[in-house]
């Protein structure tokens, strides 16, 4: 998927439905690709991405990828089709309404990824499943 400023014409008359027969229409996701981040050692972070995009295809979900290596921390926000791997990993949690980060094995870095299926759900990335989104101590992530 590509963000709106380079989005190409799409005209697919197929109606996409989920497993329960509910119609799936393109959802809204944060879409800033890769940005430097200061989100570290927190239960939850906000993406601080100002771009909300309409995903190109109805089956796409919101994805966030948090990576830390010796040099920096980055946060990636995109739309992606859960039928296709992303960064070589399957999006196992694509039906979740919340973006709950799961660690993945990647050599040379700490790598967390989450996916979710409610509008703009990759704006709030959760590293602790016990974390309650109404927690007033929510810390904002600041991009460089």
């Amino acid at each position: 998927t590509i963000p709106p400023h380079v989005q190409k014409s799409v005209n697919n008359d197929m109606i996409v439905t989920d497993n329960n027969g509910a119609v799936k229409f393109p959802q809204l996701c944060k879409f800033c690709d890769v940005r430097f981040s200061t989100c570290d050692n927190q239960k939850s972070c906000m993406s601080n991405c100002s771009i909300t995009s309409i995903c190109e295809k109805p089956q796409e979900v919101c994805v966030a990828v948090w990576r830390k290596n010796d040099e920096n921390i980055t946060l990636e926000t995109v739309c992606h089709d859960p039928k296709l791997p992303y960064h070589d990993f399957i999006l196992e949690d694509a039906a979740s309404p919340k973006c709950i980060m799961k660690e993945k094995k990647k050599p040379g870095e700490t790598f967390f990824m989450c996916s979710c299926s409610s509008d703009e759900c990759n704006d709030n990335i959760i590293f602790s499943e016990e974390y309650n989104t109404s927690n007033p101590d929510l810390l904002l992530v600041i991009f460089q």
Epitope: F25, D119, C121
Partner: antibody, heavy 116, light 107 residues
């Protein structure tokens, strides 16, 4: 099939209150941002406000013309969107549409007439 | 708020004509621009989103272009069912404002 059905439109006096409802079906209501858009007779479209998903806090945004008078809420257990309108003015007379925010799904609209 | 200005406010055209409607934003909105069609007594229908992406089910005679502040909706060959009012809407910032509309009438 996605369906949005508004109800609650009526004739009301200036200063009065009214609550509109929008019953949603055919999609996962709890996952979607929802909006109200209105259209005064013979005029253009005007965005009224939106409510975001409950999991992201159910945050609301409003147009300046209705802020402080109108309240948008949602009940995900009933798949229903609401618009509580207080301190109504004659210029609030319009057809009110319920929509899935920024996507092409609209209700048929419900007419609100504010007149003495 | 971002102001959206459409021109012309109305136009008369014949079946088969090429029709162009323009929309100007009071500040840059990147490509966060949608076009709607509305017929009397009906809810609006989304034609184009993200300035140039054709909504599912919309005929290919409709196209959109532009970015920044200036945008265009083009109907390559006007059909009888295209006589309606067209609105642009920016979704770059809240509130997502509409243009005042362009009524396309039969000449």
């Amino acid at each position: 099939e996605v369906q949005l059905v508004e109800s609650g439109g009526d004739l009301v006096k200036p200063g009065g209150s009214l609550r509109l409802s929008c019953a949603a079906s055919g999609f996962t209501f709890s996952n979607a941002w929802m909006s109200w858009v209105r259209q005064a007779p013979g005029k253009g479209l005007e965005w009224v406000g939106r409510v975001k998903t409950t999991v992201s806090g159910g945050t609301t945004d409003y147009a300046a013309a209705v802020k402080g008078r109108f309240t948008i809420s949602r009940d995900d257990s009933k798949n229903t969107l609401y618009l509580q309108m207080n301190s109504l003015k004659t210029e609030d007379t319009a057809i009110y549409y319920c929509t899935i925010d920024l996507r092409d799904y609209w209700g048929q609209g419900t007419l609100v007439t504010v007149s003495s | 708020d971002i102001q959206m200005t459409q021109s012309p406010s109305s136009l008369s055209a014949s079946v088969g004509d090429r029709v162009t409607i323009t929309c100007r934003a009071s500040q840059s909105i990147s490509s966060y621009l949608n076009w709607y069609q509305q017929k009397p007594g009906k809810a609006p229908k989304l034609l184009i989103y993200a300035a140039s992406s054709l909504q599912s089910g919309v005929p290919s005679r409709f196209s959109g272009s532009g970015s920044g502040t200036d945008f265009t909706l083009t109907i390559s060959s006007l059909q009888p069912e295209d006589f309606a009012t067209y609105y642009c809407q920016q979704s770059y910032s809240t509130p997502p404002t509409f243009g005042q509309g362009t009524k396309v009438e039969i000449k």
